[in-house]
């Protein structure tokens, strides 16, 4: 059904990292425009990105209201210049997205090593607690604030002079590891949500090495 001038959107795909969430779809419009609606399973539809020629719509503001809810979106197609026109059944063409639960599915962004500090044969490595767009009481929550203990970090570390990697894990954003005196080490971290079935791990952080500016070295 639908007018001869419009085609239904297809390949509706959620792209989400640290709760920044965009719905993408195809095709690029030719003589048509799109409007997106989003809803929770039990809620009302809310329209976004009215009559757009884009093939993406930022739905972050909606999903951050409750990241544990499951959302459904749909993309309506309208003839350009005649958005009141509907399909033969009296409705504009539309296509549903897959369901999306931000808490369970948003990709974990690449973490950053905030600092490292050596004290004797111990090195304290701190992972930056990245701010998300999830708000509570008018403040933006960090990744740790949102995920709590569901989020762990894995630290990979190795002597600059060798390739043998060691690992440590933490339920916080800090590590305290033993190192050999007089040796320089390199570090990389990864965010992990072990309880997930999909999107469990982030990409590895950029590598940071001792003897470079980010860290601090104290011989005690």
């Amino acid at each position: 059904s639908g007018t001869t001038n419009t085609v239904a959107a297809y390949n509706l795909t959620w792209k989400s990292t640290n709760f920044k969430t965009i719905l993408e779809w195809e095709p690029k419009p030719v003589n048509q425009v799109y409007t997106v609606q989003i809803s929770t399973k039990s809620g009302d539809w809310k329209s976004k990105c009215f009559y757009t020629t884009d093939t993406e719509c930022d739905l972050t503001d909606e999903i951050v209201k409750d990241v544990k809810q499951t959302y459904l979106a749909r993309v309506f197609s309208y003839p350009a210049g005649n958005v009141e026109s509907t399909g033969s059944a009296g409705e504009p063409l539309y296509e549903n997205s897959p369901e999306f639960t931000p808490y369970l599915e948003t990709n974990l962004g690449q973490p950053t090593i905030q600092s490292f500090e050596q004290v004797g044969t111990k090195v304290n490595v701190t992972v930056e607690d990245e701010r998300t767009l999830v708000r509570r009481n008018n403040t933006f929550l960090s990744l740790r604030d949102v995920f709590g203990k569901d989020l762990i970090y894995t630290l990979y570390y190795w002597k600059s002079s060798s390739s043998g990697k060691k690992t440590a894990k933490t339920n916080t954003n800090e590590f305290l590891i033993d190192v050999d005196k007089g040796e320089n080490y390199c570090f990389s971290v990864q965010a992990v949500i072990p309880s997930r079935t999909v999107n469990r791990k982030s990409t590895d952080s950029p590598v940071e090495c001792m003897g470079q500016e980010k860290g601090e070295f104290r011989e005690i």
């Epitope: 509570r136 604030d145 949102v146 709590g148 440590a168 916080t172 309880s195």
Partner: antibody, heavy 125, light 108 residues
């Protein structure tokens, strides 16, 4: 040092909602720890109910999830438990506890190191 | 959920003897998430061991923990009168966090 104190009615009628509050003294509820509720049925073992972070992030026992709400009030340094539709099977001693980070194996993990004394809640008409 | 089975249910020993308490998990538990608690009548539990083998602050060195995977052990090298209590193992690596059924260490 941190101390916890549970408060709330000791008697709740069946089908009603059990409401308990845990007051944290000697430290801030916002200081990077988690705050838990655990219960112990008469003469039995311990059952974890759920936990909350100061940000409001929660984890619940799936067996109780549909009936449980844990909330935090950072301004009062308190966190609370609500358990709806109670039955006699919810009669227990209810404990609140702090889950604090301890160093282990290169990282930090949380353990319940400070507990309240516990409050007995009886569900009966 | 991970079921923790403690044995024996009751251990009858005399002061000065060695107590060995077992905790077996229904599936593998990361040692980082395994703790032991002591509970005396009318009191709240007290953290003894965390990370399977590390003593909590103020815990005497007669208490030690060991094990990995599915088998964990709490050992009290020489029982003191104040050690007679119920001991629980607990895991908080997987929701729901679970406790073992407890082992009662009583005076023989």
């Amino acid at each position: 040092q941190v101390q916890l104190q549970e408060s709330g009615p000791g008697l709740v009628k069946p089908s009603q909602t059990l409401s308990l509050t845990c007051t944290v003294s000697g430290g801030s509820i916002s200081s990077g720890q988690y705050w838990s509720w655990i219960r112990q049925h008469p003469g039995k073992g311990l059952e974890w109910i759920g936990e909350i972070y100061y940000s409001g992030s929660t984890r619940y026992n799936p067996s109780l999830k549909s009936r449980v709400t844990i909330s935090v009030d950072t301004s009062k340094n308190q966190f609370s438990l609500k358990l709806s539709s109670v039955t006699a099977a919810d009669t227990a001693v209810y404990y609140c506890a702090r889950d604090a980070p301890y160093y282990y194996g290169g990282g930090y993990y949380y353990y319940m190191d400070v507990w309240g004394k516990g409050t007995t809640v009886t569900v009966s008409s | 959920e991970i079921v923790l089975t403690q044995s024996p249910g009751t251990l009858s020993l005399s002061p000065g003897e060695r107590a060995t308490l077992s905790c077996r998990a229904s599936e593998s538990v990361d040692s980082s998430y395994l703790a032991w608690y002591q509970q005396k009548p009318g009191q709240a539990p007290r953290l003894l061991i965390y990370g399977a083998d590390s003593r909590a602050t103020g815990i005497p060195d007669r208490f030690s923990g060991s094990g990995s995977g599915t088998d964990f052990t709490l050992t009290i090298s020489r029982l003191e009168p104040e050690d007679f209590a119920v001991y629980y193992c607990q895991q908080d690596g997987v929701v729901p966090y679970t406790f073992g059924g407890g082992t009662k260490v009583e005076i023989k």
